[in-house]
């Protein structure tokens, strides 16, 4: 099942087969250059549909520039199918499934004053299924609440803080939002989850949770990027993989990751027996786009230069602001994991036949479901954790 | 099956050193942490530090740093603990106790060394 | 570092009666351990993880709690549980023992 995996996944993070910019690595290691003793954790799917709803009413240059930063090649796949793939991706993730649990939505918060152009509402109602509210962004505090309250709603709970403030020259807000729940295939036993090591780096120890479980896994050992990589499948479709690098190695294997490479892991894994140890972790990642995506190409429209004619008629709406957050979790029933972009225009967003795999220094993770939900290198796990003993 | 065998008792002088060992068997002693543990008369545990031989990391508590010595020799699947400049504080039963992956840590224990310090 | 603090010191139980020891941590843990120990001998894990009875540990024990505070108890005492009882912290380093509780049997 795992070769059906490969075939389907899109792992741009976007429904188009052909790019010329790895969007998703590229945005990885700017994240990861700009602080690298950091976790990182992101949705590339949330960031990509947050970007492709934003093209939905860009115009000329800015439009191009946001398709381009997504690595997309109009001439080969046309705009209207990029969104319509977007619109059938969202109806795939929120079908409902046992033990899986992935709901994936837009909205769109608008000041009472601004008059929004018919026809970019209905295709964002139509293909990206998004809300749209009314909002007095006067009353900041009051518009701050109620884009807050709603997703939190809208993702449980797990992201309740995605604006911390808001700008009361702000007209429209274009939230996305991911929430993921998920069960292992086979849960960690508690009973083997014991206190462990984790070396932040060799001088650095902390304590963790560490899960346990034997089994047969997909594993592979890449000697190329001197890493191991391991996928843990969930109910449903998704697997995770984790990704340990050899002893001072991180930066090798963060180099390295590309489209092809997580193909090529997908499709090389094979069953092994090992002795996993996983910590049992939290980490988030929140990032402030508008800084991030000019060095991906994407800058006309966090500027005045920025065309957003198709959104409104006012002339003079740019982005000013993008924030994306996302939160995940790892525990022995599975991982949940949640992510949110805001857009505001200001757009805001032992044994001889086993091998003993330990996760006990930084390591990098990817949740796949046909597309790539979440990407992240855990450097030091968070520590919010009740859980059982050490090595 | 798993064993830690810990040297004898030792009698020594204040101010001299005492090198105490604590031999592995039934286990590869760089798969796992030796801990060691200090036991006062008629008093409670203390932990002293533990060794990591697959990453060469040594952590004492803070109390013991500079005066007590953890090493380990992989050949011999032995680790050692030294005790210098010895006073009667020091005067002690000093257990080996095995760190675990696949069975919990502090499962299996050392009979004990007692050190005692007397002029 | 983390202190433990075991309560009570010395205690003294009759055949039968319900037995429980606390320990208190002075700041949050993830799990608590507790240790068997009778004169002469080496420690012995009885309790790991907060609430798993190691291999041997006769059912009446049992181990509970979260955060800061956790604790041991013997549904039914039995003249073979005399013996002094160390809860011991592994969140972070230093690890910790509590000072000791003395199991008597009445």
């Known amino acids: 099942e795992m070769k059906k995996r490969v075939e389907d996944l899109h792992v741009g993070a976007t429904v188009a087969p052909s790019s010329r910019r790895d969007f998703t690595f590229d945005l990885y290691r700017v994240l990861a250059s700009a602080a690298p003793s950091q976790n990182i954790f992101f949705s590339p799917v949330s960031i990509s549909m947050s970007l492709a709803m934003l093209s939905l009413g860009a115009g000329s240059s800015t439009k191009m520039q946001i398709l381009e930063g997504l690595g997309l090649n109009l001439q080969k796949s046309s705009e209207e199918e990029l969104h319509r793939g977007f619109q059938q991706l969202l109806q795939e993730l929120n079908q409902p499934r046992d033990g899986f649990q992935l709901s994936l939505g837009n909205a769109l918060f608008t000041d009472l004053v601004v008059d929004l152009q018919d026809t970019f509402v209905s295709a964002m109602k139509t293909l990206y299924l998004a809300d749209t509210f009314p909002t007095n962004f006067r009353d900041s505090a009051g518009a701050m609440k109620q884009i807050n309250d709603y997703v939190a709603k809208q993702t449980k709970g797990k992201i309740v803080d995605l604006l911390k403030n808001l700008d009361s020259n702000a007209v429209v807000i274009m939230v996305n939002y991911i929430f993921f729940k998920a069960k292992w295939e086979t849960s960690f036993n508690h009973k083997g989850t014991q206190e462990q090591d984790f070396y932040v780096t060799s001088e650095t120890v902390v304590r963790v949770p560490m899960m346990s479980r034997e089994d047969q896994y997909h594993y592979l050992l890449d000697r190329n990027l001197s890493c191991r990589v391991v996928g843990v499948p969930y109910q449903g479709n998704a697997t995770a993989l984790f990704i340990l690098p050899s002893e001072g190695k991180m930066q090798q294997v963060e180099n390295g990751l590309s489209e092809k490479t997580l193909r090529k892991w997908l499709k090389m894994f094979k069953k092994r027996q090992l002795e996993l140890y996983l910590p049992k972790f939290s980490i988030e990642g929140s990032y402030q786009l508008e800084k991030v995506l000019p060095s991906l190409g994407i800058s006309n429209v966090f500027t005045s230069h920025a065309d957003l004619s198709g959104i409104s008629n006012h002339s003079n709406i740019q982005v000013s602001e993008m924030v994306h957050k996302a939160v995940v979790e790892v525990d022995e029933s599975g991982t949940r994991a949640a992510a949110a972009t805001g857009t505001i225009f200001t757009f805001r967003s032992a044994r001889l036949n086993s091998q003993r795999l330990v996760f006990n220094r930084p390591f990098l993770m990817f949740i796949v479901d046909n597309n790539i939900l979440f990407l992240g290198k855990v450097n030091r796990p968070g520590s919010d954790y009740k859980d059982d003993d050490d090595k | 099956e798993v064993q830690l065998q810990q040297s004898g008792a030792e009698l020594v002088r204040p101010g001299a050193l005492v090198k105490l060992s604590c031999k592995a068997s039934g286990f590869n002693i760089k798969d796992y942490y030796i801990h060691w543990v200090k036991q006062r008369p008629e008093q409670g545990l203390e932990w002293i530090g533990r060794?990591?031989?697959?990453?060469?990391?040594?952590i004492y508590d803070p109390k013991f740093q500079g005066k007590d010595n953890i090493t380990a020799d992989t050949s011999s699947n032995t680790a050692y603990l030294q005790l210098s400049s010895l006073t009667s504080e020091d005067t002690a039963v000093y257990y080996c106790?095995?760190?675990?992956?696949?069975?919990?840590?502090?499962?299996?224990w050392g009979q004990g060394t007692l050190v005692t310090v007397s002029a | 570092q983390i202190v433990l603090t075991q309560s009570p010191a010395i205690m003294s139980a009759s055949p039968g009666e319900k037995v429980t020891i606390t320990c208190s941590a002075s700041?949050?843990?993830?799990?608590m351990h507790w240790f068997q120990q009778k004169p002469g001998t080496s420690p012995k894990l009885w309790i790991y993880?907060?609430?798993n009875l190691a291999s041997g540990v006769p059912a009446r024990f049992s181990g509970s709690g979260s955060g800061t505070s956790y604790s041991l108890t013997i549904s039914r005492m039995e003249a073979e549980d005399a013996a002094t009882y160390y809860c011991?912290?592994?969140?972070?380093?230093?690890?910790?023992f509590g000072s000791g509780t003395k199991l008597e049997i009445k």
């Open positions: 060794i990591d031989l697959e990453k060469g990391n040594i």
């Open positions: 993880s907060t609430s």
């Open positions: 011991q912290q592994r969140s972070s380093y230093p690890f910790t």
């Open positions: 106790a095995r760190g675990g992956y696949d069975v919990p840590s502090f499962a299996y």
């Open positions: 700041s949050s843990v993830s799990y």
